[in-house]
Interface confidence: low
């Protein structure tokens, strides 16, 4: 199905406009600023939410170390171009002609240049470290619990299929979900796990997509789970290719 | 919306047999089924389950003894070798499954009886 | 995860309520639901995530309990209440025995 049937909505999207103007009446949707037709049965690519977060009015919007060639998401929102397909453009250019490269969860991966940069291909981002930290609690979070309640989540809530959350690491009060997913393992139809860390990123900041569904509402054994801060690590196939200067 | 067991009848030990379970009126792809049996008399015993994204579950005992798959868009099938008369039981499909939507069966078919015996 | 239900049997009079017990091997966060069955026929849900009712279930019944202890009270007994129940886990799915509990048969005179 494309869409809720009964009211014509996009239950994993709230940023699109519905109408039942698809084959036989059916219900279609399409995501807002690129108005590509976008399957409402599971998460809307990182790329599409992008664009369509871009056009929506402005008020709308054991530990594991980070290997040296993980990337932070530090430039922030923009505008992306994305493909027919939803996914992002190898590179990226704003409106004063720089161009970048970025991998596929559109983080940058290399210096900034002008519009002769080549970005040949888009590179697979198959390492993603979630690293939280949770508010303060009476005792720390049973790991076992914890671990089951959080690949729940990315299983139900977000559709990743487990065998993708490749570990949850504790050690109060920081919380480590590590998702992998290379090219040969992501069969068609398998969520991306970008898309899943995107959907979980913007549940815990308070800012859902999903359509008239509550709030993440996450709790072990009873206890509510609040988060109070995040920061998000990006291991891609190929490092990424950095001028020195920017590494001192 | 039903689920239908079919399949089930008399089989020599040793025999195999394959059930379906064949789901109507709800979308196949939102859903778990699981598959749990009923031994004469006894209780109800899980003996797993196919998920939404293909991915399957058994209960210890039955890892590697029996095989679920989901054949069609509508139908899942719950795969039986080497039976013994230990395995005579009404055998139900169910919607739902563990750890997965509120983790339990809201919709059950009405089950198939397989009896081994020689 | 393995699930233990006490009495196997009880009999209750017409009027009266009855307390069946679920107590899982470790904590299942609430993810307990609990099933009727009469002779002959599938199981009826009705309750989840321990406290929940299904579908059409009269308020007669109530689920309680957190961890690895449950409850099902059934008050104002009538005789269409004569049947088994059974609990059943939700929570552990890789290294379950059998997520069901034993059963209750519940007798009413």
């Known amino acids: 199905h494309t869409a809720a049937q009964d009211n014509c909505t996009c239950p994993t999207n709230k940023m699109t406009v519905c109408s039942p103007d698809g084959p036989g009446g059916r219900c279609q949707c399409r995501a807002l600023g690129s108005g590509m037709a976008v399957d409402c049965s599971t998460l809307t690519s990182k790329c599409l939410l992008l664009k369509a977060r871009m056009s929506a009015p402005k008020n709308a919007r054991t530990l594991v170390r980070p290997s040296e060639h993980a990337l932070v998401d530090n430039d922030g929102l923009y505008d992306p171009d994305c493909d027919p397909e939803g996914r992002f453009k190898a590179r990226q250019c704003n409106q004063t002609s720089v161009c970048w490269c970025v991998n596929s969860v559109g983080v940058r991966r290399t210096d900034k240049g002008d519009l002769s940069l080549r970005c040949d291909e888009l590179v697979r981002t198959h390492h993603i470290l979630i690293d939280l930290r949770h508010r303060p609690t009476a005792g720390a979070f049973n790991h076992s619990d914890l671990d089951a309640e959080l690949r729940r989540l990315f299983r139900e809530r977000y559709r990743l299929h487990p065998k993708f959350v490749a570990a949850v690491h504790y050690e109060q009060p920081t919380i480590q979900i590590e998702l992998r997913q290379n090219t040969s393992q992501k069969a068609a139809g398998d969520v991306d796990i970008g898309d899943a860390a995107y959907y979980f990123e913007r549940d815990i900041k308070g800012e859902s997509l999903f359509q008239g569904r509550g709030g993440l509402d996450l709790r072990v054994r009873g206890e509510p789970l609040q988060v109070e801060r995040t920061l998000i690590y990006y291991l891609d196939e190929i490092p990424p290719k950095f001028s020195m200067k920017r590494l001192t | 919306q039903s689920l239908e067991e079919s399949g089930g009848g008399l089989v020599k030990p040793g025999g195999t047999l394959t059930l379906t379970c064949t789901v109507s009126g709800f979308d196949f792809s939102n859903y778990a089924v699981t598959w749990v049996r009923q031994a004469p008399g006894e209780g109800l015993e899980y003996i797993g389950f196919v998920g939404i994204y293909g991915d399957f579950y058994y209960a210890n005992w039955a890892k590697g003894r029996f095989t679920i798959s989901k054949t069609s868009s509508t139908t899942v099938t719950l795969q039986m070798p080497s039976l013994t008369v230990a395995d005579t039981a009404t055998y139900f499909c169910?919607?739902?499954?563990?750890?997965?939507?509120?983790?339990?069966?809201?919709?059950w078919g009405p089950g198939t009886l397989v009896t081994v015996s020689s | 995860y393995d699930m233990t239900q006490t009495p196997a049997s009880v009999e209750v009079a017409v009027g009266g309520t009855v307390t069946i017990n679920c107590q899982a091997s470790?904590?299942?966060?609430?993810?307990l639901a609990w099933y009727q069955q009469k002779r002959g026929q599938p199981p009826k849900p009705l309750i989840y995530r321990a406290a929940t009712l299904a579908s059409g279930v009269p308020s007669r019944f109530k689920g309680s309990g957190s961890g690895t202890e449950y409850t099902l009270t059934i008050s104002d007994l009538e005789c269409a209440d004569a049947a088994t129940y059974y609990c059943?886990?939700?929570?552990?799915?890789?290294?379950?025995?059998?997520?069901f509990g034993g059963g209750t048969e519940v007798v009413v005179k």
């Open positions: 169910a919607r739902g499954g563990l750890w997965t939507g509120n983790s339990y069966f809201d919709l």
């Open positions: 470790e904590s299942i966060n609430r993810y």
């Open positions: 059943q886990q939700g929570y552990g799915y890789s290294t379950v025995g059998n997520a």
